[in-house]
Interface confidence: low
């Protein structure tokens, strides 16, 4: 009498999520009498997938008519595969009894499920940073299988190299997640820049998924300040201009101080954008020279995006000149054209 063999011809089967899988199994003998059962996994914790005689298995059907008298084909068909179905499936022959006794198991067929990664989500830093600082962007994508995946970072089309990537978990799993953190050095020209995280996977047929983040949400470009005086007007009024240039974002408050006292406060709004995405703003202050006996110290104070104020001062010389000779009024810029370096980077 020939010894019973349980043959599972495929060592592994790979199926796309949503498709059906066929797991093949044949036996070489009709003896002993008893049912075939399919399990996922081995050992005491194995999961019953299909029982030839009893139970309800809505997604599993027998490929051949397993109830036919001389049937030796016990292959099964599993529909609507999900990543949770991944695992090793065993076709197991039992001898009829009370209870049935396991006789022999097939070698097992590993079912792997090809699942697409989710659209990459790129998140940037919680607080803005200024040019020359380095900020981190994180890209995450989930739910893919198999584990092999490629992730690349780009800034404005140029590939980045300063990043660290990990695929989780390290061991076998029904599906995987990828997380990558890239470090990007900001420049003043980055208001319109983008970082792109690109994920390539076997399920994407060469068409990678991309996630993007705008550097405009991560960058702060502090303003340049310049205070100048226009020529003295006939009515003894001096027009002093504070030019605030090349800043981003638009959130900015400007305060004029005369000899240390607040004269006027303005908020920037609805400004036109420069080509590089930054903004400019000009504010004027009229000073009546005849109302002052001594020199007037004017300060243009700018608070940008919640950062410490930047000051630029300017002296209007009135004491050395008769009021009627207003055109000879001298001006002195006591500020500097240097950028204010007190912006805090978190």
């Amino acid at each position: 009498e020939e010894e019973l063999q349980v043959i599972q011809p495929e060592k592994s089967v790979s199926v796309a999520a949503g498709d059906s899988a066929t797991l093949n199994c044949t036996v070489t003998s009709l003896i002993p009498v008893g049912p075939i059962q399919w399990f996922r996994g081995a050992g005491p914790g194995r999961e019953l997938i299909y029982h030839q005689k009893e139970g309800h298995f809505p997604r599993v059907t027998s490929v051949s008519e397993s109830t036919k008298r001389n049937n030796m084909d016990f292959s099964i068909h599993i529909s609507n595969i999900t990543p949770a179905d991944a695992g090793t499936y065993y076709c197991v022959k039992f001898r009829k009894g009370s209870p049935d006794v396991e006789v022999k198991s097939g070698a097992g067929t590993e079912l792997s499920v090809r699942a697409k990664p989710s659209a990459p989500v790129v998140s940037g830093p919680a607080v803005r940073a200024t040019a020359e600082h380095t900020v981190s962007f994180t890209c995450e994508s989930h739910g893919f299988s198999p584990r092999d995946i490629t992730l690349k970072w780009f800034k404005n089309g140029n590939e980045l190299s300063d990043f660290q990537t990990n695929v989780d978990p390290a061991g076998k799993s029904v599906s995987y997640s990828i997380r990558s953190t890239a470090r990007v050095v900001l420049t003043r020209r980055d208001v319109h820049s983008q970082v792109i995280c690109e994920v390539a996977h076997v399920t994407l047929q060469g068409d990678p998924l991309r996630g993007t983040a705008n550097l405009s949400e991560a960058i702060r470009v502090p303003p340049f300040l310049e205070v100048t005086q226009q020529s003295m007007r006939a009515d003894n009024q001096v027009n002093v201009t504070c030019q605030v240039t090349k800043f981003y974002p638009q959130r900015l408050q400007l305060t004029w101080l005369e000899n240390g006292n607040v004269s006027r406060t303005e908020m920037a709004s609805a400004l036109p954008e420069n080509k590089d995405g930054t903004y400019n703003w000009t504010s004027w202050l009229l000073v009546n020279v005849s109302a002052h006996r001594d020199d007037v110290k004017l300060t243009c104070q700018v608070e940008h995006d919640g950062q410490p104020a930047v000051n630029k001062s300017f002296s209007v010389k009135v004491s050395a000149h008769p009021k009627e000779q207003g055109s000879n009024t001298a001006a002195e810029n006591t500020g500097t054209n240097e950028r204010n370096h007190h912006h805090h980077h978190h």
């Epitope: 990043f163 990990n166 390290a170 997380r179 470090r183």
Partner: antibody, heavy 126, light 107 residues
Framework: QVHLQQPGAELVKPGASVKLSCKAS????????INWVKQRPGQGLEWIGN????????NYNEKFKTKATLTVDKSSNTVYMQFSSLTSEDSAVYYC???????????????????WGQGTLVTVSA | DIQMTQTTSSLSASLGDRVTISCRAS??????LNWYQQKPDGTVKLLIY???TLHSGVPSRFSGSGSGTDYSLTISNLEQEDIATYFC?????????FGGGTKLEIK
């Protein structure tokens, strides 16, 4: 090239603390984990913990959780390990080593130590 | 924690010999096994990572193999400069753990 610089020796009294340093150079300090490894005289190697300079994430071996504290000074590319309540059992050579494995923020793949410091000999003695 | 066992704590061999040092893990470490060399002066160097990948600058006479729980390091043609203690380390699961070491001496 990659270099991890450690002081040669520290002599400390029982019950005191010691702060060991590991100064890194020759690579992007922020994106590699730095590990600390203990070796008692004539014994094997024991992993204490590691720190990721960029995010200051840390992992500790349970055995050393109350004993070791890892910190980083990014401005000087230096990692520190503070060892507290010292006893004779803490007399050992302490190495720092750079991780080469691809893992980030608590998610792990295989990990190996590609570059090692020369080690600091800590002697605990009254 | 995963226990790493190097059953041979010391080994004597002659120059030119082929030497094999073994290491066993208490559970499957999926090839995340690394080998280090510690010279008598205490200097530690990585030799091999991920079971069989040679670290840059390591001579080709060193090789590694194994899978599951059993791994080995082989030196095909022993040289004087190979006199050292060799440690295995698993990089599969925190905390990272090392074998007790195998001290290689010249006969």
């Amino acid at each position: 090239q990659v270099h991890l610089q450690q002081p040669g020796a520290e002599l400390v009294k029982p019950g005191a603390s010691v702060k060991l340093s590991c100064k890194a150079s020759g690579y992007n300090f922020n994106i590699y984990w730095i590990n600390w490894v203990k070796q008692r005289p004539g014994q094997g190697l024991e992993w204490i913990g590691n720190i990721y300079p960029s995010s200051i994430s840390t992992n500790y071996n349970e055995k050393f959780k109350t004993k070791a504290t890892l910190t980083v000074d990014k401005s000087s590319n230096t990692v520190y390990m503070q060892f507290s309540s010292l006893t004779s059992e803490d007399s050992a050579v302490y190495y720092c080593a750079r991780s080469e494995g691809t893992y980030y923020g608590g998610r792990y793949e295989g990990d190996w130590f590609g570059y090692w410091g020369q080690g600091t000999l800590v002697t605990v003695s009254a | 924690d995963i226990q790493m066992t190097q059953t041979t704590s010391s080994l004597s061999a002659s120059l030119g010999d082929r030497v094999t040092i073994s290491c066993r893990a208490s559970q499957d470490i999926r090839n995340y096994l690394n080998w280090y060399q510690q010279k008598p002066d205490g200097t530690v160097k990585l030799l091999i990572y991920f079971t069989s990948t040679l670290h840059s600058g390591v001579p080709s006479r060193f090789s590694g193999s194994g899978s599951g729980t059993d791994y080995s390091l082989t030196i095909s043609n022993l040289e004087q400069e190979d006199i050292a203690t060799y440690f295995c380390q698993q990089g599969n699961t925190l905390p990272w753990t090392f074998g007790g070491g195998t001290k290689l001496e010249i006969k």
